[in-house]
Structures are given as C-alpha cells and as structure tokens.
C-alpha cells in the first residue's frame, strides 16, 4: 500500500489525463482526488497506466466506495476491471447489459476468469432469469458459456432465449445439460415446419427421448452421423433398423465406420442380425436368427 504523503506543489490533478502516467505511485495516491477519478473513469482506459498505477487507482476507488462501486463507475472500469477480485464484484449491483458488455470486452480473447464468472452470476441473479439478450451477449463472448451452467441453472432459461443459442454454444454440453435444454428448444421451435424445425433442433437432440427420434424418422430429415453419435444411448436403443435407416437417410452408410462406438455398438447388439443385414453394410454383432429376446425391464415393470 502506498503511504500517505502530501501532494507536491503544482502536481494536484485537475483532470484525469496523460500527465498522470509519469506520476509515481505515491504521487497518484496524494494528488488524484478519488471523486475526480470516479467522475472521469471513462478517461482511465484511454491512458496507458502501468499495472502498479492501476493498483493505486483501484485503492482510491475502494476507499471512496467501501460498499461497492456504483454502476456509473463500473461501466467505465475498462482494464481496471482485471484488477477486481470476485469479492469486490460481489458487492456490485450490475443491471445494465451495456455495463456487462463493456466489462466482457476487456476480457475478450481470454478464458472466463473467476472475476467474469462472478460478474455474470451477479448479473443473471439480478435479472432473475437468463433472458435472450443476456444469453446473446454471453454466448457471443463465451461460446461455451451455456455448457458451464449446471442443469439447475439452465432450468431458469426461458424457451424464448433458446433462439439465441448457436450450435457451437452447445459443443461442450453433457447429456444432463441437454436433457434440460432439449424440451425448451422443442417448445421454442414448435411452430416451425419440418425441415426448418430439424435445422434448429438438431444441436439439442442429445437430450431427445426415443419417441421424438421415432417421430423425426418419419420426416425424411437425413440426420448426419455426428448428430446421431451424440444422441442418448438409452434413446437410440429402442429404435428399429427401419427407423434408424429413415432417420439417417443417405448417411446410414456411416454406421459401418462407427460400429465399435456408442451408441451404434450398443444399438447393434439389440437388433436382429437379419434386420441389420437388410442395410447391406456388413454390420455384425446383432442377435442371431432363432434367438428369443426377453425385455427384462418390461417384465419387471409388469410384475
């Protein structure tokens, strides 16, 4: 911490300008009025203060606003935001999307830091839900943002916000997250026609149940193998060979290359070999002809 010393004659800052770059830390502490700094925060980012000088400026703001900075200051923090700790940020009340954007811009190109995560958490909690504009903004800066949320947090996403989600935003989502997002997407896109609907719903299908996959198989959607491989294994297993063939269309030939990987491997084990042979792909591992298949899960349910 910079010790308190009187400001030298003629060095009292009348405004935040470039001359301050050449002040020593103690001079900044002694000669820059915290209230002046707060009212001219928009200038700070345009001045190439050193890392150490930014520490002094932060200290001055902390003294002026011990309960947390007002949004008028937060919006103009610029690179000073990188000096904030999660504890500092928890004191803030950020309500403006413009403020959020301004701070995310500072961190652009870097991974999500603890500061950013805290800022987003504060912002979303303040809004009560992850609305479309917020989601638009967050996924623009952090394509993996949606997949960093827990299923519980995702449950607060209104279906209308799903329109803001791009396929790449879901790249790192696990099945539990897609289980939450898929019904919302289904609801959001329900009024679209077949082919348009499939284009939009495709990246969410990792959360789709068997009955929805069966319905899609009747719509000539030609699902690609990459999408098929991301489907829930338990949703794929009950599909018949005919249904999978219809679901994949011309892409069905890709099953051969994936026959050793889930869910294709597990699905093959559940199909009759003679049914698999009808595909003409040389898929092996199905149930031999003449064998009886007992669905024990169904038997347990009946008893």
């Amino acid at each position: 911490e910079v010790e308190k010393t009187a400001c030298p004659s003629g060095k009292k800052a009348r405004e935040i300008d470039e001359s301050l770059i050449f002040y020593k830390k103690w001079e900044l502490e002694a000669c820059v009025d915290a209230a002046l700094l707060a009212t001219q925060m928009d200038r700070v980012n345009a001045i190439p203060f050193t890392y150490e000088q930014l520490d002094v400026l932060k200290h001055k703001l902390d003294e002026l606003y011990p309960q947390g900075y007002p949004e008028s200051v937060i919006q103009h923090l610029g690179y000073l935001f990188l000096k904030m700790s999660p504890e500092d940020i928890r004191k803030w009340n950020v309500t403006s999307l413009e403020t959020l954007k301004a701070l995310l811009e500072v961190n652009k190109g870097h991974e999500m830091s603890p500061q950013v995560a805290t800022l987003i958490d504060r912002f979303v909690k303040g809004r009560g839900q992850l609305d479309k504009d917020t989601l638009d903004t967050l996924t623009a800066f952090y394509p993996g943002y949606l997949c960093s949320l827990s299923p519980e947090e995702l449950s607060s996403v209104p279906p209308s916000s799903i329109w803001a989600v791009r396929p790449q935003d879901l790249d790192t989502c696990d099945p539990r997250q897609l289980d939450v997002l898929y019904p919302k997407a289904r609801l959001a896109f329900q009024n679209m026609n077949g082919s348009e609907y499939f284009v939009k719903i495709q990246s969410f299908l990792g959360g789709a149940p068997t009955e929805d996959l069966k319905a899609l198989s009747q719509q000539n959607v030609s699902m690609d193998l990459a999408t098929f491989m991301k489907l829930r294994t338990d949703a794929v297993l009950p599909l018949t060979v005919a249904e999978v063939q219809k679901l994949l269309g011309p892409h069905v030939e890709g099953l051969k290359a994936e026959e050793r990987h889930r869910p294709v491997r597990d699905w093959i084990l559940r199909q009759r070999q003679d049914d698999l042979d009808t595909l003409g792909l040389g898929l092996q591992g199905g149930i031999p002809n003449g064998y009886l298949v007992l669905d024990l899960s169904m038997q347990e349910a009946l008893s």
Partner: antibody
Framework: EVHLQQSGPELVKPGASVKISCKTS????????MHWVKQSHGKSLEWIGL????????SYNQKFKGKATLTVDKSSSTAYMELLSLTSEDSAVYYC????????????WGQGTTLTVSS | DVVLTQSPAIMSASPGEKVTMTCSAS?????MYWYQQKPGSSPRLLIY???NLASGVPVRFSGSGSGTSYSLTISRMEAEDAATYYC?????????FGGGTKLEMK
C-alpha cells in the same frame, strides 16, 4: 538478464514507411511500459511515445502524433514502432527503452536502429 | 513542454578531478534522471529520482537538486567517464531531455 534487441539499419526513400522492432527478453513484458526515443545525428534525445504492453494503451508526444504508431505483440514480447510518410528530417537513430518500476528512469535500452531517409 | 538547459555544453577534466554539471528546468519538477552516452552506444541510466544510483553505477557518481536546479557530480574523474551526459524529466508531460554536456578527458 534483461535484453532489448532492435532490428537492423534501414535505408528508405522519402514518402515511404518503415517498421522497427524491439524484441525483449529476461523480464515479464507486460509489467513495464516501452518507450521510443529519437536521436538525430549529433543531437540530443527526444521522447516519441510509450506503449503499455499490458493493455496496448499508447501515449504520444504531440510532435510525433501521426508520424509514429506504436504496437506490441505479446506472444513474442516484441514492441514495434512504425514511422510514416518519411522525410529527411526523420533520419536518426531510434531507441526503444524500458521504463523502470514506478517511473525510475529508462533502465534498459535497445542498441538503436539507424534510419536513413534518402532518395 | 519543460525545457531542460544543461551547462556547460562541453567540459574537460583531468583524471582524479571532481566534475560537476548542471541542469536547469524551465519550471519546477519533482525528480531528475541522468544518463551517460558514449559514441556509438545507447544511453545508460546513471541516476534516478534525483539522487539514487542505478544498478551497476560506480559510487563516484552522485546527483542532487530540487525545484528547477539539479546537478550531477563525479567525485574523481576517470578515463572511462568521458562521454555525453543527459538530464531528463517526466514530472511534466511530455518527458524531455536536456541538450547534453560533453565531458572530455584532459
């Protein structure tokens, strides 16, 4: 050991532009501001401006605004100065210099880059 | 801009002699910095914050002053001290350098 290595001498025609580099090593590049200084033949030193590698912020001597453009490449810890619309008045030795902690002088200097502007 | 005027412009000294050169500022400044430059070489920081010796600088060098008047002293001149010496300030924006004092060996 701190080292500032500048690019070699340049001979350019009037009206052209030139970009001088200053590759640093031996310290954390983003923790110190980099300054550029001009020394005309047999003359004193003139401060051109500075760049803060931490955030890319710049500050220029009014006299060199529009003449010099300062940039950095953090990945290679290198500072650059581009000089535009060159005239014979720009012929000089140009130095990059690191500003010491808490404004304690220009503590390390590059070896200098000689620029000759001639047709 | 703050103008720094160095005097004398040229001086000479014998080995072992005490040498003092001055730097006068057109307005009051907080700190002065001194650099040594030999022909064909880059400037080298000698004194920072008016009176502090930079790393590796011999103790025969010292700096003093305040306000508008500053000086650099070499307690005992040595052959290797023959060079041009520049004062510099950045108390006022933009930073400026003096015109230099050329010190020659007698």
């Amino acid at each position: 050991e701190v080292h500032l290595q500048q690019s070699g001498p340049e001979l350019v025609k009037p009206g052209a532009s030139v970009k001088i580099s200053c590759k640093t090593s031996g310290y954390t590049f983003t923790e110190y501001t980099m300054h550029w200084v001009k020394q005309s033949h047999g003359k004193s030193l003139e401060w051109i401006g500075l760049i803060n590698p931490y955030n890319g912020g710049t500050s220029y001597n009014q006299k060199f605004k529009g003449k010099a453009t300062l940039t950095v490449d953090k990945s290679s810890s290198t500072a650059y100065m581009e000089l535009l619309s060159l005239t014979s008045e720009d012929s000089a030795v140009y130095y990059c210099a690191r500003r010491g902690y808490d404004n304690e002088g220009f503590d390390y200097w590059g070896q200098g880059t000689t620029l000759t502007v001639s047709s | 801009d703050v103008v720094l005027t160095q005097s004398p412009a040229i001086m000479s000294a014998s080995p072992g002699e005490k040498v003092t050169m001055t730097c006068s500022a057109s307005s009051s400044i907080s700190y002065m910095y001194w650099y040594q430059q030999k022909p064909g070489s880059s400037p080298r920081l000698l004194i920072y914050d008016t009176s502090n010796l930079a790393s590796g600088v011999p103790v025969r060098f010292s700096g003093s002053g305040s306000g508008t008047s500053y000086s650099l002293t070499i307690s005992r001149m040595e052959a290797e001290d023959a060079a041009t010496y520049y004062c510099q300030q950045w108390s006022s924006y933009p930073p400026t350098f003096g015109g230099g004092t050329k010190l020659e060996m007698k």
